[in-house]
């Protein structure tokens, strides 16, 4: 069980990021979906290494204080969301702005039925270009 | 089936990054190889986790415009090469230069003959102290 | 055999991060083990998927000149420690500080007894905050 | 809006060059393998040429192949095609393309055309 | 290079009834392959890709088909508007290569 999604711009204001299975993606069977394109669900419990790339481009001055942070979070049916991972970085004084990358991955137990998805402070600034912005999975 | 090589410095002008089977390596039998210092080649098609790891030292006065790039591409036989994978982060204005490390890290299927390399946009700002750089793949 | 545990503040002087069996962490059977919640100890041979990541907040003028350095750590029974992978980061011109993470992973031969730690240049510095520090492995 | 515009065809002799271009618009022109794709008159469709995001790999059709280049400004989000030694069997409408990014990376957009007379 | 041998060259249909064109790989091309519509004076529009996966804004009375070296493209109800010369194409390796097309006409 596998997957891999890629990220796609979005008229939307919500926090969470847009995926497609586009480009050179991957979902190994149908025992892990991309559900409403923005969240992979499994439908087999167990151990599964959960990763997301953001690449996105940024200004300290035209952004807020706050660091850009991105967070992989977790939804199982009947529990509250949970963050796994965040990573944070700063803004950087690059004009326009300038572009940096997050990674983030974890062993993490699912549930079946579980969905993982991406959060960031500010999904106006992720980049779409070829590879630089992805998200996946692989059961263990 | 499962590889990690080790950067190497190399005085070849060529943006593709050379790796070398030396230091705490990993190449688990002969289904993956190295070739020619500067790509991993697998035999068997399916699944695999590719990653790298790359750090870098770059000064923005010193350097272009546009960012440092690192990509992880794909070349099967007989097919156009691709990006898989990118990350890219702005130049430090620290000097002479400021350290900054990019990981990469993803699942794609693989076909027989399939290879992976990866490309920098000025591998002369690669550091290749233990550890920094890095470079490899495992078989689900 | 997989684990991922999460990290802790420490009030030692030692740059060794500190981690914890808490929050949404992993830890599959006893053939993985945390030990004195600084490093994680296999008891089968085998390649290994290692991973940690880190997130830090400094400022350029409060700090070394030296960048920010992680390094993921190998100490085999009988045998040096030693060093399998590092990132570095420069230190931000944000006040007070400034944030960035850094996300480190490879597949490793480990030997029975081996623990893997991770080290950083200012412990102090490290961001503990739900999800942003972790440490991890798998087994292939 | 058609996103690919070519210009630069036209009637030339044999053994002559000439230098088509196809200007792109609507989409980040680095992120996209590029084509060209011909067509002799009243004929089917024969593949020219392809080049890679930003340029660093080329791949030909093994009728051009020593006698066309493929190149591309990314600045001016240009594609071109120099064509030398030319030879009356290269007489067709020239059409630039865009590869997808799918694994197939097939042609999912075409500009008008541009005819190549070579007499 | 893959031959792709492409049947009927040519076929004339009426209003409404379903049409199929017929694309025979050199060898197995796993699915790599792609359908174009080129009608009169105008240039190959995408129809199909991965054989079977309708490109976006395309009619679903179109639909494809098929595996290994064997493919089929199926337009369920000729409409006057499917008057036009299709191709199939392999990108399973280079050089890329076409079929040498059908024409269509509306009887």
């Known amino acids: 069980i596998a997957a891999h999604v890629i990220s796609e711009a979005s008229s939307k204001t919500t926090s969470v990021l847009q995926w497609a299975e586009k480009g050179y993606y991957t979902m190994s069977n149908n025992l892990v979906t991309l559900e409403n394109g923005k969240q992979l669900t499994v439908k087999r419990q167990g151990l599964y290494y959960i990763y997301a790339q953001v690449t996105f481009c940024s200004n300290r001055e035209a952004s807020s204080q706050a660091p850009f942070i991105a967070s992989l979070c977790l939804k199982s049916p009947g529990r509250f969301e949970r963050i796994l991972l965040r990573a944070a970085n700063t803004h950087s004084s690059a004009k326009p702005c300038g572009q940096q990358s997050i990674h983030l991955g974890g062993v993490f137990e699912l549930q079946p039925g579980a969905s993982v998805f991406v959060n960031v402070t500010d999904p106006s600034q992720v980049s779409h270009g070829t590879g630089f912005t992805s998200f996946g999975l692989l059961k263990l | 089936i499962a590889a990690h090589v080790i950067s190497e410095a190399s005085s070849k002008t060529t943006s593709v990054l050379q790796w070398a089977e030396k230091g705490y390596y990993t190449m688990s039998n002969n289904l993956v190889t190295l070739e020619n210092g500067k790509q991993l080649t697998v035999k068997r098609q399916g699944l695999y986790y590719i990653y790298a790891q790359v750090t870098f030292c770059s000064n923005r006065e010193a350097s272009s415009q546009a960012p440092f790039i690192a990509s992880l591409c794909l070349k099967s036989p007989g097919r156009f090469e691709r990006i898989l994978l990118r990350a890219a982060n702005t130049h430090s204005s620290a000097k002479p230069c400021g350290q900054q490390s990019i990981h990469l890290g993803g699942v794609f299927e693989l076909q027989p003959g399939a290879s992976v390399f990866v490309n920098v946009t000025d591998p002369s700002q690669v550091s290749h102290g233990t550890g920094f750089t890095s470079f490899g793949l495992l078989k689900l | 055999i997989a684990a991922h545990v999460i990290s802790e503040a420490s009030s030692k002087t030692t740059s060794v991060l500190q981690w914890a069996e808490k929050g949404y962490y992993t830890m599959s059977n006893n053939l993985v083990t945390l030990e004195n919640g600084k490093q994680l100890t296999v008891k089968r041979q085998g390649l290994y998927y290692i991973y940690a990541q880190v997130t830090f907040c400094s400022n350029r003028e409060a700090s070394s000149q030296a960048p920010f350095i992680a390094s993921l750590c190998l100490k085999s029974p009988g045998r040096f420690e030693r060093i399998l992978l590092r990132a570095a980061n420069t230190h931000s011109s944000a006040k007070p500080c400034g944030q960035q993470s850094i996300h480190l992973g490879g597949v490793f031969e480990l030997q029975p007894g081996a623990s893997v730690f991770v080290n950083v240049t200012d412990p102090s510095q490290v961001s503990h905050g739900t999800g942003f520090t972790s440490f991890g492995l798998l087994k292939l | 809006e058609v996103p690919l515009v070519e210009s630069g065809g036209g009637l030339v002799q044999p053994g002559r060059s000439m230098k088509l271009s196809c200007v792109a618009s609507?989409?980040?022109?680095?992120?996209?393998?590029m084509a060209w794709v011909r067509q002799a008159p009243k004929k089917g469709l024969e593949w020219v040429a392809s080049?890679?995001?930003?340029?660093?790999?080329?791949y030909y059709g093994d009728s051009v192949k020593g006698r066309f280049t493929v190149s591309r400004d990314i600045a001016k989000s240009t594609l071109y095609l120099q064509m030398h030694s030319l030879k009356s069997e290269d007489t067709a409408i020239y059409y630039c393309?865009?590869?997808?990014?799918?694994?197939?990376?097939?042609?999912?957009?075409w500009g008008q055309g541009v005819m190549v007379t070579v007499s | 290079d893959i031959q792709m041998t492409q049947s009927p060259t040519s076929l004339s249909a009426s209003l409404g009834e379903t049409v199929s064109i017929e694309c025979l790989a050199g060898?197995?091309?796993?699915?790599?392959l792609a359908w174009y519509q080129q009608k009169s004076g105008g240039s190959p529009q995408l129809l199909i890709y991965?054989?079977?996966r309708l490109q976006d804004g395309v009619p679903s009375r179109f639909s494809g088909s098929g595996s290994g070296t064997r493919y089929s493209l199926k337009i369920s109800g000729m409409r006057p508007e499917d008057e036009a010369d299709y191709f199939c194409?392999?990108?399973?390796?280079?050089?890329?290569?076409f079929g040498s097309g059908t024409k269509l006409e509306l009887k």
């Open positions: 080049i890679s995001y930003e340029g660093s790999s080329t």
């Open positions: 194409q392999q990108t399973f390796r280079y050089p890329l290569t």
């Open positions: 393309a865009r590869h997808d990014d799918s694994p197939g990376y097939y042609f999912d957009y």
């Open positions: 609507g989409f980040t022109f680095s992120d996209y393998y």
């Open positions: 991965a054989a079977n």
């Open positions: 060898e197995d091309i796993s699915n790599v």
